[in-house]
């Protein structure tokens, strides 16, 4: 069966009818249907007027405006709101309401495209092995990216989040639309990778996507991540500004010139420094999300009410942090390099630079304790990825986790860690699943480019096709039409399950207590710590090329929600990835081609683009009671500076950088808290209590009724961050 | 100008087919997609389904599929709107609208036939 | 199927009168049009894309709203204005709403 012609509320679109194999399967493939209209730089995106006639939908579109991997050109267009479908076919009827996978791709915020990189004939975000394996339509597109997509005064001026609304923008036409192609409505799956899986995480928080979105699935990135939120946008606007020579003084005004300045020139006026780095890469990424009081109304610790009905799964890769290590310290991947306890403290120092030297101090001692007993490169090594992986990927995700279970009503809540080893032959051996590693296996490239692979990386995409898009159908990774090696249990705040994703998978494969000692340590220990004053706090900025001004610590709050304690050591989900990694060649010596790339261009990866390094807090304990968020308000971003002097200073953090008091038993009492006028809130039960969703503020496109003063909204402080 | 005009009324019995007609004239007959829209008496406006005419393509809504063929002659400027197995509950004025441009909203509209379906 | 609610159902008022037709879609939608209907006549287009006026119609009619919530507005009623209005959308499967009759008070 084939579908034809489709009417769309653009109009007709006609895309290409693939068969496969001689059984009379098949599958439609529409490639480059406008959702949107051409954009406008720095405004939010327009409907598309539609057109007449069938629109030939039969190649990917361009990639949005972004710079390549030299950084001294752009390629892409500023006419790229394009997304792609497969909708598999079997032999007779045509197919209807099948469920809908969405994927939202990775790159840092930075760069990347709805198709991915291109590699032996076979594009890495190909939605046909999933559509196919899986019985489900498979939607990708493009979004804003870097300034286009990211840059925002801070204000009304330049609101910012234009690529997040590019993204509703595509979810919402899927909701409209996708029934004309088989697909059912009521069943859209958002999915993503790093950058991606923290724009899925956010798009669940967001009450402009209230009803649009049934489940959600974040690989390697989720919206707590501390590379996520730029609370000084204002910063970074400036240095794109003074690049391109507008006005710096005035918001209204620099906003007005930057919105007639050349798209390109705004591109190419931000650069990522990638070597020679004097802090963390992390704090050279400066446009992505930021709390705009609408589409993300606060911080996202304090959205999670509005996920309460999404079911959702969260993991990371077990060396997440390893590709972002290597750049910050390139020793990692270098057999004749040796990583010293100075470099190890030093970065250490970067990452914790709001806590001093306290912060600095407890951190490397806490991660260096294996050191004594092995002092060997490969353990120190590790221990450096270890730490980045903890920071910028898994502490996150197991807070995000739990902040879904405290406040899912009907939702279920899954964790995984994708450990199948990186297959980068340039690697040391030591080396797990980098950053990206996994999408290589949800795309099913074992499958559609077969001789870069081996029988066991088969099985590993089977494994997590079948997972994937059971849950896509069902809610439950377990039950659908696709058979799994082995029972996926849900994450609860009291057994922090996780499945480990593995070449062999059986039993065994539900782990608990993942880190324990290190959540446990950012989650008490670390948060407890007295945050050092703005003078202690500010970093030189390198100097030379205002590329390489570093991002300031900007978080607003020290205070993240200390979850129940205990000593379950509930583990926490590693995050998962970002897709700037590199390509990920065939180990073995088979003389195989290497695997694609996972990133979307040959761009070096690009970090995780947060303001701070720090994870927000997850729960450790075992009192069986879910985190139990504060109710106060801190989300709001803090006013960035407004002059132009140097580097902006270390935003306040409060009178109190002190945690709530978690509760030590099962007795379901809410924490003592703080009761001066620290950061902390009184901390109320929230459980399945029914909060509203926060609402955005203007009177946005499909905002729902806001709370009311008496709601029972669960609220928390800002992540930590660093 | 744009000008689209319908067949005249017709009365059916129930199981019966109906085919109704709108031919257009004052603009490219091919250049825009043709919607066929229902009113019953003193009901509101629903949507049946639309043809491109300058392919033959069709779209149309979940309620009528398997009832409804539109088709389209092109050396006539016409579009055919063909319900089949007819009920009582298809009595109703049945309209042609042109798309205004773009795939905007329906611009122009034929006088609208009477389709009657009794017994 | 998208639903279209629009309110009131009817609505009584004079001529000079300014008056307010809403509708709200569920889930949101991109673009909305507006069509006016005299008894016997086929419908007519007045308002698309949610705020423009389509050729030939009077100024006094204006649109407004985006996602979820859109409203007609007359602005001083005229005697010819009394009819019954519809909100439709565009998707793959355009929905109308149930209309709005406007009679004179």
């Known amino acids: 069966a084939k579908l034809g012609a489709v009417y769309t509320e653009g109009g007709f679109v006609e895309g290409v009818n693939k068969k496969l194999g001689l059984l009379g399967d098949s599958v439609d493939i529409f490639k480059g249907i406008p959702f949107a209209a051409p954009t406008k730089a720095l405004e939010n995106p327009q409907p598309h007027p539609g057109w007449q006639g069938t629109l030939k939908a039969k190649n990917f579109k361009k990639r949005c405006l972004q710079a390549t991997i030299t950084q001294d050109s752009t390629y892409g267009d500023e006419d790229c709101l394009y997304l792609n479908i497969w909708v598999p076919q079997g032999r007779k009827q045509v197919s209807r309401d099948l469920p809908v996978m969405i994927w939202i791709y990775g790159g840092a915020f930075l760069m990347g495209s709805g198709h991915g990189a291109n590699f032996l004939n076979n594009y890495l975000y190909d939605g046909e092995e999933i559509a196919t394996r899986g019985n489900v339509i498979v939607v990708t597109f493009n979004y804003r990216v870097g300034p286009l997509g990211f840059l925002s005064t801070g204000d009304a001026n330049l609101p910012g989040n234009y690529g997040l609304r590019d993204q509703h923008m595509a979810i919402a036409w899927v909701k409209r639309n996708i029934a004309a192609f088989g697909g059912d409505p009521n069943n859209i799956t958002l999915f993503g990778e790093s950058a991606g899986g923290a724009s899925v995480s956010l798009q669940t928080l967001s009450p402009y996507n209230k009803g649009l979105i049934r489940r959600a699935i974040s690989q390697s990135g989720v919206a707590l991540s501390p590379w996520v939120i730029q609370k000084n946008p204002l910063f970074w606007a400036k240095k794109v500004a003074e690049k391109v020579g507008c006005p710096v003084g005035d918001a209204a005004r620099m906003a007005q010139c930057l919105k007639v300045t050349d798209p390109r020139a705004l591109t190419l006026a931000y650069k990522v420094p990638l070597a020679g780095l004097e802090y963390p890469m992390l704090h050279y990424v400066g446009f992505v999300p930021v709390i705009d009081g609408d589409f993300i109304p606060a911080d996202p610790i304090n959205l999670y009410a509005n996920a309460a009905d999404i079911d959702y799964i969260a993991g990371t890769n077990n060396m997440d942090g390893h590709i972002f290590a290597s750049i910050d310290m390139p020793a990692i991947n270098k057999g004749n390099k040796k990583v010293t306890e100075e470099d190890f403290y030093k970065l250490v120092s970067e990452f914790t630079i709001t806590k001093g030297l306290r912060g600095a101090k407890t951190t490397f001692d806490v991660y260096t304790e294996s050191w004594a007993q092995d002092p060997s490169q490969e353990n120190k090594k590790k221990t450096v990825v270890d730490f980045e992986t903890d920071v910028l990927f898994l502490v996150p995700t197991e807070i995000a986790l739990a902040q879904h279970r405290a406040n899912a009503k009907s939702a279920k809540t899954y964790a995984y860690l994708f450990s199948h080893p990186s297959r980068m032959p340039v690697y040391p051996k030591w080396v797990g699943a980098d950053h990206a590693d996994d999408i290589q296996y949800v795309f099913g490239k074992p499958f559609a480019t077969p001789t870069g692979y081996r029988p066991q990386d088969r099985t590993v995409s089977k494994a997590m096709i079948a997972y994937w898009t059971n849950f896509a159908k069902t809610g439950d990774p377990n039950m659908g039409d696709s058979a799994v090696p082995t029972h996926w249990e849900p994450y609860t705040t009291e057994n922090s399950g996780y499945l480990e994703i593995t070449k062999k998978m059986g039993s065994s494969s539900m782990k608990r207590s993942l880190r324990t000692n290190f959540l446990r340590y950012w989650t008490l220990t670390y948060l407890a710590l007295p945050t050092v004053t703005d003078q202690e706090a500010t970093p030189v900025p390198p100097t030379g090329d205002s590329e390489a001004t570093p991002v300031p610590p900007t978080g607003d709050s020290e205070t993240a929600p200390v979850p129940p304690t205990g000593d379950s050591g509930a583990p926490p989900v590693p995050p998962t990835g970002d897709s700037g990694a590199p390509p990920v060649p065939p180990t073995g010596d088979s003389g195989a081609p290497p695997v694609p790339p996972t990133g979307d261009s040959g761009a070096p990866p690009v970090p995780p683009t947060g303001d701070s390094g720090a994870p927000p807090v997850p729960p450790t304990g075992d009192s069986g009671a879910p985190p139990v968020p504060p109710t106060g308000d801190s989300g709001a971003p803090p006013v960035p500076p407004t002059g132009d002097a140097g580097p902006p200073p270390v935003p306040p953090t409060g009178d109190s950088g002190a945690p709530p008091v978690p509760p030590t038993g099962d007795s379901g009492a809410p924490p003592v808290t703080p009761t001066g006028d620290s950061e902390t809130a009184p901390v109320p039960p929230t459980g399945d209590s029914g909060a509203p969703p926060v609402p955005p503020t203007g009177d946005s496109e499909a905002a729902p009724v806001p709370p009311t003063d008496d709601s029972k909204e669960a609220q928390m402080p800002a992540v930590i961050r660093f | 100008q744009v000008q689209l005009v319908q067949s005249g009324a017709e009365v059916k019995k129930p199981g019966a087919s109906v085919k109704v007609s709108c031919k257009a004239s004052?603009?490219?007959?091919?250049?825009?997609?043709m919607h066929w829209v229902r009113q019953a008496p003193g009901q509101g406006l629903e949507w049946i389904g639309v043809?491109?005419?300058?392919?033959?393509?069709?779209s149309y809504a979940q309620k009528f599929k398997g009832r409804v063929t539109m088709t389209r002659d092109t050396s006539t400027s016409t579009v055919y709107m063909e319900l089949s197995s007819l009920r009582s509950e298809d009595t109703a004025v049945y309209y042609c609208a042109r798309d205004y441009y773009g795939s905007s909203p329906l611009g122009y509209w034929g006088q609208g036939t009477l389709v009657t379906v009794s017994s | 199927d998208i639903q279209m609610t629009q309110s009131p159902s009817s609505l009584s008022a004079s001529v000079g009168d300014r008056v307010t037709i809403t509708c709200r879609a569920s889930?949101?939608?991109?673009?909305l049009n507006w069509y006016q209907q005299k008894p016997g006549k086929a419908p007519k287009l007045l308002i698309y894309a949610a705020s423009k006026l389509a050729s030939g119609v009077p100024s006094r009619f204006s649109g407004s709203g985006s996602g979820t919530d859109f409203t007609l507005t007359i602005s001083s009623l005229q005697p010819e204005d009394f009819a019954t209005y519809y909100c439709?959308?565009?998707?793959?499967?355009?929905?109308f709403g149930q209309g709005t009759k406007l009679e004179i008070k």
């Open positions: 889930p949101s939608i991109s673009y």
């Open positions: 043809i491109n005419p300058g392919d033959g393509a069709t």
């Open positions: 004052g603009y490219t007959f091919t250049s825009y997609n």
């Open positions: 439709h959308q565009r998707s793959s499967s355009p929905t």
